[in-house]
Interface confidence: low
Amino acid sequence: GITIPRNPGCPNSEDKNFPRTVMVNLNIHNRNTNTNPKRSSDYYNRSTSPWNLHRNEDPERYPSVIWEAKCRHLGCINADGNVDYHMNSVPIQQEILVLRREPPHCPNSFRLEKILVSVGCTCVTPIVHHVA
Amino acid sequence: GITIPRNPGCPNSEDKNFPRTVMVNLNIHNRNTNTNPKRSSDYYNRSTSPWNLHRNEDPERYPSVIWEAKCRHLGCINADGNVDYHMNSVPIQQEILVLRREPPHCPNSFRLEKILVSVGCTCVTPIVHHVA
């Protein structure tokens, strides 16, 4: 057969738990070059289901800072600027991947972790339970 | 600042690009055990700014399948169930981390990548530009 040098090859993993342990290059490639990150920055104030952003910080996690949305009201803001409790402000949640240092304090060893974060809020019609 | 000692049990990195290249355990720890994943599953229909979910698939990426929200209307649904164009349905976007296989075909080598995804939609008051 044809011998192809190992130039384009894959890094070896010495880890016995392989394939669970992989090499990850943290030099992040950002595919959002054409997007304006500020374009949704004021939605939290202008929404009929406005929210506040809370800083969730954890030095053992990457990214270490995550912003969590908390809906300001149980109801939604109506055309008069008042809270309408016939509607509900609810958080839109998403599962995201983060890296957690494992063992703790190790600069070059992480575990992949799924966490649920609230990204913003939306206004929904409530589910009404009728009592017989 | 406080110096965090380097845990003596940390794996060494032979990689010349260290600390850019780290070891990651892919045996995912899910911290969402107490959450009900279905609890926001119908918000996309019940919202005053409803959205559809589109499957974004990429076999070079982990996770391979990401669901993208697309707002159904430019306006928002009013109390009569009609679209009110005095308000705007807008996507709530979030930057998330994904892993991209690099080099291709390598089962144990990835690069961290940031992508912008639309998680859901919210109803906002439009910004009105007054012409002098």
Partner: antibody, heavy 124, light 107 residues
Framework: EVQLLESGGGLVQPGGSLRLSCAAS????????MNWVRQAPGKGLEWVSY????????MYADSVKGRFTISRDNSKNTLYLQMNSLRAEDTAVYYC?????????????????WGQGTLVTVSS | DIQMTQSPSSVSASVGDRVTITCRAS??????VAWFQQRPGTAPRSLIY???NLQRGVPSRFSGSGSGTDFSLTITGLQPEDFATYFC?????????FGGGTRVDIN
């Protein structure tokens, strides 16, 4: 049903050129990495070239590097292999092969679907 | 690159027999092994991936095992349509490589 159909093979003289095509159907072509694999008469299989789903990344076996070019047209659901400076040792059946998806498991990607192949004969 | 040494190069068997084909990798490839079946004049067909996972639609008489450097494909209860050539394939590292093939003939 996933289908891959190669075309463009034939008899060519040493030093000549050929362009192979692979028409894909039954799946979303633009989602998948694709490959060319060849099989010399009565011999084993040899990976030739790879192209990523977007077409932005390509790889070649050393035996064809500089002579072969892989490309794709996602709007036409078609994979191509431009073969220049052909040699007698390039004589083989050429298959296009799809990389498997890798849902969740991060278990690596193998060739999950293959075409029927097209025969390339390099001879004077 | 990683060499995949497949044995035997051919085997004669009868319908109903149990046939085992082995593949040895030149270095540790963990479980990144796939097996293909190729009937004369047709395209290779994926049977097994990840050493032991059956591709959708493949009969359960096919099974795979092994880890590290030694792998095997077993056909339990050979059927007429199983007479073909079988290839192992490593996808642990570029360049992706294949075994030389094992031809399963009718006895």
């Amino acid at each position: 049903e996933v289908q891959l159909l190669e075309s463009g093979g034939g008899l060519v003289q040493p030093g000549g050129s050929l362009r192979l095509s692979c028409a894909a159907s039954g799946f979303t072509f633009s989602f998948y990495n694709m490959n060319w694999v060849r099989q010399a008469p009565g011999k084993g299989l040899e990976w030739v070239s790879y192209i990523s789903s977007s077409g932005g990344l390509t790889m070649y076996a050393d035996s064809v590097k500089g002579r072969f070019t892989i490309s794709r047209d996602n709007s036409k659901n078609t994979l191509y292999l431009q073969m220049n400076s052909l040699r007698a040792e390039d004589t083989a059946v050429y298959y296009c092969a799809r990389d498997s998806p890798d849902y969740g498991a991060l278990g690596g990607t193998y060739f999950d679907y293959w075409g029927q192949g097209t025969l390339v004969t390099v001879s004077s | 690159d990683i060499q995949m040494t497949q044995s035997p190069s051919s085997v004669s068997a009868s319908v109903g027999d149990r046939v085992t084909i082995t593949c040895r990798a030149s270095q540790d490839i963990r479980n990144y092994v796939a097996w293909f079946q190729q009937r004369p004049g047709t395209a290779p067909r994926s049977l097994i991936y990840g050493t032991s996972n059956l591709q959708r639609g493949v009969p359960s008489r096919f099974s795979g095992s092994g880890s590290g450097t030694d792998f095997s494909l077993t056909i339990t209860g050979l059927q007429p349509e199983d007479f073909a050539t079988y290839f192992c394939h490593q996808y642990s590292s570029n360049p992706l490589t294949f075994g030389g093939g094992t031809r399963v003939d009718i006895n």
